[in-house]
Each structure stands twice: as C-alpha cells, then as structure tokens.
C-alpha cells in the first residue's frame, strides 16, 4: 500500500557527462513523526535501488559511490545527488520511503535525467604577457566541475620548458619559462574525467615576447640578385652612381622597430630612415662609410653595420676639375 507524492520542480533534468546534478526531493508534509523509514531511489523498472540510506540494502553496482541519497528528515530533504554522470545514467528515477515495520510507504512521481555530451572545455588563463626567460604561471581551469565529483586528471603538453605547480579539484597550474623559439608553438591542457571516461582539451598558441636575436641586411644593387649580410661587414664595394637598396630585418616579438643611421650612432642619434628600408638612389662620396641598422625592442636592442666602399668611374673623375 503506497501513498503517492509529487516531486517539486521540473519533470526532467539535464546534466553533461562527467558532471554532477542534484535531483530535488522533499518528503511529504503529511509524513507522521512516527514514520521512521529508509529512503530508496530507484531507476524506473528496477528492483535494486541506485541509492539508499538503508544499511542492509545493496545498491546497483553501476551507481555505487556516484549516487547518494541526501537524507535530512528535519528539512524534509530526500534529494538524489549524482556525480560523474555517465551516458547510461540517462533514465527515469523515483524515490520511495519505506519501512518494513509499517504498512504503507511513500512513493514519489518520476523524474527523468538526461545525460548529454560534455560541451564545456577547459579554460587556459595567462597572467599578462609571456616573456622569454621569465617564468609565468598558466592556469587550466574547469570551473564547471563540481567539488564532490571525482577530481579530473590534468595533462599539459608543450615544447617549452615547464614544471607543474599546485592543483585543485577545478584547476592546475603550469609554470612555463618560454624561449624565443617557443613563440607561436602550441600549448595544450587536457582534462580527463575518470568517473565518466570523458576527455576534453583546449589548445592555445603561445605569444612569447622576446628581444631580437638576429638582425640581417639584404642588399639590392641595380638589377642584380640580392644578397644578405648576417654580421658586421668591414667593406662592401659599390660602383659610383649605382642605386642601392638596403633592407634590414630582425626577429623579436612584438616586432622590433627598425631604423637606419649613418655612421655608428649614439643612443639618441637621429635616424636617416625610420623604417627597415634605406634607399640610396645614387651612391656617391657622401655615402662612403658606415651604415647601421638598429632593431629596437622593449626587451633589448640589436644592431648590424656595413661599410660602403665606393668605386669611382674613370670618366667621372676627369670631367670634374
């Protein structure tokens, strides 16, 4: 003989795989003080409960340790807590209050639990900017994970030098000391939910700030093929009157500011070009000597120089007296 009561709230609840959900249940107000029963949550159509506070009753193997009856008769609470939700938990459930000593029990209405695919992904947060050679703490967090669930397993993947920092149920810290070559490389945080056997990941591209490591000059002479200078050059022969285009490029992130100077500049010298390009339309005596390209960057500067040696055309000298 059963007395029926209605579960408050929605007729169905949705939970994502690996996460938690609370199925709300309140004992009927008509329940007499003398009714000392045990509470049982059942999967519709099953005889073995998924959760109970009856010490003599077995629960289903599949739900043991994941489904818990939150029993508080004073607050009339008979809610069901589900953690580490699995696809096969997708079903209808009902609550039953029963005592073998009493004639009647109390049975609730049914409530459906819908288990959906996990769509949440981990978040990776970086405090400020990543600077080459300086350690930074990256945090991979899963704030949507419930505290009472089986703690997720965090895995990090990166080519950069790293070490693991502290972790909580919902986050893991990775200390990274990036190098210039780690700029634009991938860093992945992978989170596995062992209770449900689900894995999610997020990948970011590292944006590493670093000072210029290399600076080079490409030289374009007339229509001839360009060639590149990678280190300071003592002397580059150039024919008088020839057009010369000097192109300076440097690495560094963010990009370094490139400028050209004639001679070996002091720190506050005025550049002859504020870009990486220096156009010399007609090389003459004024251009003989040193030209310096400076790559300026907040994290450090680098420069490269080349020395122009002008070859004079024979007829050019004779006609000039």
């Amino acid at each position: 003989q059963e007395r029926r009561f209605q579960l408050e709230g929605p007729e169905s609840l949705t939970v994502q795989e690996g996460l938690c959900v609370l199925v709300p249940c309140r004992l009927p107000t008509t329940l007499p003080a003398s009714y000392y029963g045990y509470g049982y949550w059942f999967l519709e159509g099953a005889d073995v409960p998924v959760a109970t506070n009856d010490p003599d009753e077995e629960v289903q193997e599949e739900t043991r340790g994941r489904f818990h009856l939150l029993w508080d008769p004073r607050r009339k609470n008979c809610s069901l807590s589900i953690r580490d939700a699995r696809r096969r938990d997708n079903a209808a459930y009902f609550f039953r209050l029963k005592s073998k000593w009493m004639k009647y029990g109390y049975t609730s209405s049914k409530l459906s639990v819908r288990v959906m695919a996990l769509t949440h992904r981990p978040n990776i947060s970086i405090p400020g900017t990543l600077e080459s050679g300086h350690p930074s703490n990256l945090t991979c967090s899963v704030p949507w994970v419930c505290e009472q669930g089986t703690p997720p397993i965090f895995s990090w993947m990166s080519a950069a030098p790293t070490s693991l920092g502290p972790r909580t149920t919902q986050s893991s810290v990775l200390t990274i000391t990036p190098r210039p070559q780690d700029h634009s490389t991938n860093l992945t945080c992978q989170v596995t939910f062992p209770g449900a056997g689900v894995t999610m990941e997020r990948t970011i591209q590292l944006n590493v700030s670093y000072a210029p490591q290399k600076v080079a000059i490409s030289i374009f002479q007339g229509n001839s093929a360009a060639f590149k200078i990678l280190q300071n050059t003592s002397s580059l022969p150039v024919l008088e009157g020839q057009a010369l285009r000097l192109l300076c490029d440097a690495d560094g992130n963010p990009p370094a500011h490139l400028s050209w100077f004639q001679g070996f500049p002091a720190l506050n010298a005025t550049p002859i070009s504020n870009t990486g390009v220096l156009e010399l339309p007609q090389v003459g005596s004024a251009e003989e000597g040193d030209f310096t390209c400076r790559a300026q960057h907040p994290l450090g500067s680098l420069q490269i120089s080349l020395s122009l040696f002008v070859h004079w055309k024979p007829e050019g000298r004779a006609g000039g007296v």
């Epitope: 007499p32 003080a33 003398s34 009714y35 000392y36 506070n53 010490p55 003599d56 029993w71 508080d72 008769p73 004073r74 005592s99 073998k100 000593w101 009493m102 004639k103 009647y104």
Partner: antibody
Framework: EVQLVESGGGLVQPGRSLRLSCAAS????????MHWVRQAPGKGLEWVAV????????YYADSVKGRFTISRDNSKNTLYLQMNSLRAEDTAVYYC???????WGKGTTVTVSS | AIRLTQSPSSLSASVGDRVTITCRAS??????LNWYQQKPGKAPKLLIY???SLQSGVPSRFSGSGSGTDFTLTISSLQPEDFATYYC?????????FGPGTKVDIK
C-alpha cells in the same frame, strides 16, 4: 484519542510464563509497527522487541531472544508479549509503544520472584 | 548492536539555566536519533525525533542537533517541569537501543 493500555503484569516465579497485552485505540493499529520497552526498578529504558504492521517481521533484544515472543492480532487491535522462562532480571515495568515511539502506554509491572 | 553513551550521567541545574546533554553512538546512525523525557512513575515522552525535529506539542526551549555519531539535546532555559531523566534512542537499525540516561535535578 490515541491510546495504548498494557495489561497482564503481576508477580510470577522464576522459570514460569506470563503474557502481556497492549490494547490500542484511536489510530489505525494495523498500519503501524509496535514495540515493547521495559524499565527495571531504578534503571534506564531497555528496548525489548519490535513487530511489523502485519506481524511478518520481528526482532528481539539479545537479553530476551529465545524466551520472549512478540505477536499481534490486528482484528482485535492488540499487541502481545509472551514471556517464558522468566528470570529475576526480567522484573520491570513493561511499556508498549507505537513504531515512532511517540505514543506510549502507562506500563504494566512484572515482578519475577520466588 | 549499536551502543549509545550519554554524558553527563547526572547534572544539577537551576531554573533558567541552559542545559546540554550529549549522546554518542558507537557507529554512524545518520540522523536516526530520538530524545525522550521521563519523570518518575510515568511513561517516557518523545521530545525530539530524527535528531533535530521537535515533536508536536513540545516547548521550543528543547532542541536537538547532530548527525552521524555525535548528538546534543539542549534546553535553552530550564523550567521547573523539566527536572527529569532524559534518554537518547537510535532507530537506525535493530536492536533499537537506548542510552543510559541523564538525570537533571535541582541544584
């Protein structure tokens, strides 16, 4: 008015038997489990036995197991305690109570003495 | 069997005093604990059921708390009619044992 009234107590010699009754009124007796609880003179309460609403489940304290039998007659709204092989230490006031122990009888005194 | 111990076994108090009685179970009994008051020559009276629920008709100066193994009965302001013996009892599982009792008398 909800009421439980015990009867059947008295003076009995060790080794003899006695049957206690508990008459219920004012509630649906057949829906409730029932208890017997006793209290020796100057001592605390001791739970004795419980019976389910239909008599199919019974449980006893170790001190009375095998000697006492709890039973009920739902048609008569009456609970019983059959006490055999009585001992001096069974001397007590015997109370019947409903399953939640929110309703108690006034008790009946059993004295086991030679 | 689940054993219940009560402390203190007796106490002397004055009218208006706050009185606290504790009951400890030998294993977890969730919230399946009840408190009774008994006066000499009378049947016990249910005060608190399910550890903290006040039985209908019982004055609000009585309150219960706890769950698992440790429970407390508190009388916020002792009245003359509260001098009696108090028992805890577990209904978690058979046998349904009682504590040994705490006698509250006048100081």
């Amino acid at each position: 008015e909800v009421q439980l009234v015990e009867s059947g107590g008295g003076l009995v010699q060790p080794g003899r038997s006695l049957r206690l009754s508990c008459a219920a009124s004012g509630f649906t007796f057949s829906s409730y489990g029932m208890h017997w609880v006793r209290q020796a003179p100057g001592k605390g309460l001791e739970w004795v036995a419980v019976i389910s609403y239909d008599g199919s489940n019974k449980y006893y304290a170790d001190s009375v197991k095998g000697r006492f039998t709890i039973s009920r007659d739902n048609s008569k709204n009456t609970l019983y305690l059959q006490m055999n092989s009585l001992r001096a230490e069974d001397t007590a006031v015997y109370y019947c109570a409903n399953y939640g122990m929110d309703v108690w009888g006034k008790g009946t005194t059993v004295t086991v003495s030679s | 069997a689940i054993r219940l111990t009560q402390s203190p076994s007796s106490l002397s108090a004055s009218v208006g005093d706050r009185v606290t009685i504790t009951c400890r179970a030998s294993q977890s009994i969730s919230s399946y604990l009840n408190w009774y008051q008994q006066k000499p020559g009378k049947a016990p009276k249910l005060l608190i059921y399910a550890a903290s629920s006040l039985q209908s008709g019982v004055p609000s100066r009585f309150s219960g708390s706890g769950s698992g193994t440790d429970f407390t009965l508190t009388i916020s302001s002792l009245q003359p009619e509260d001098f009696a013996t108090y028992y805890c009892q577990q209904s978690y599982g058979t046998p349904f044992t009682f504590g040994p009792g705490t006698k509250v008398d006048i100081k």
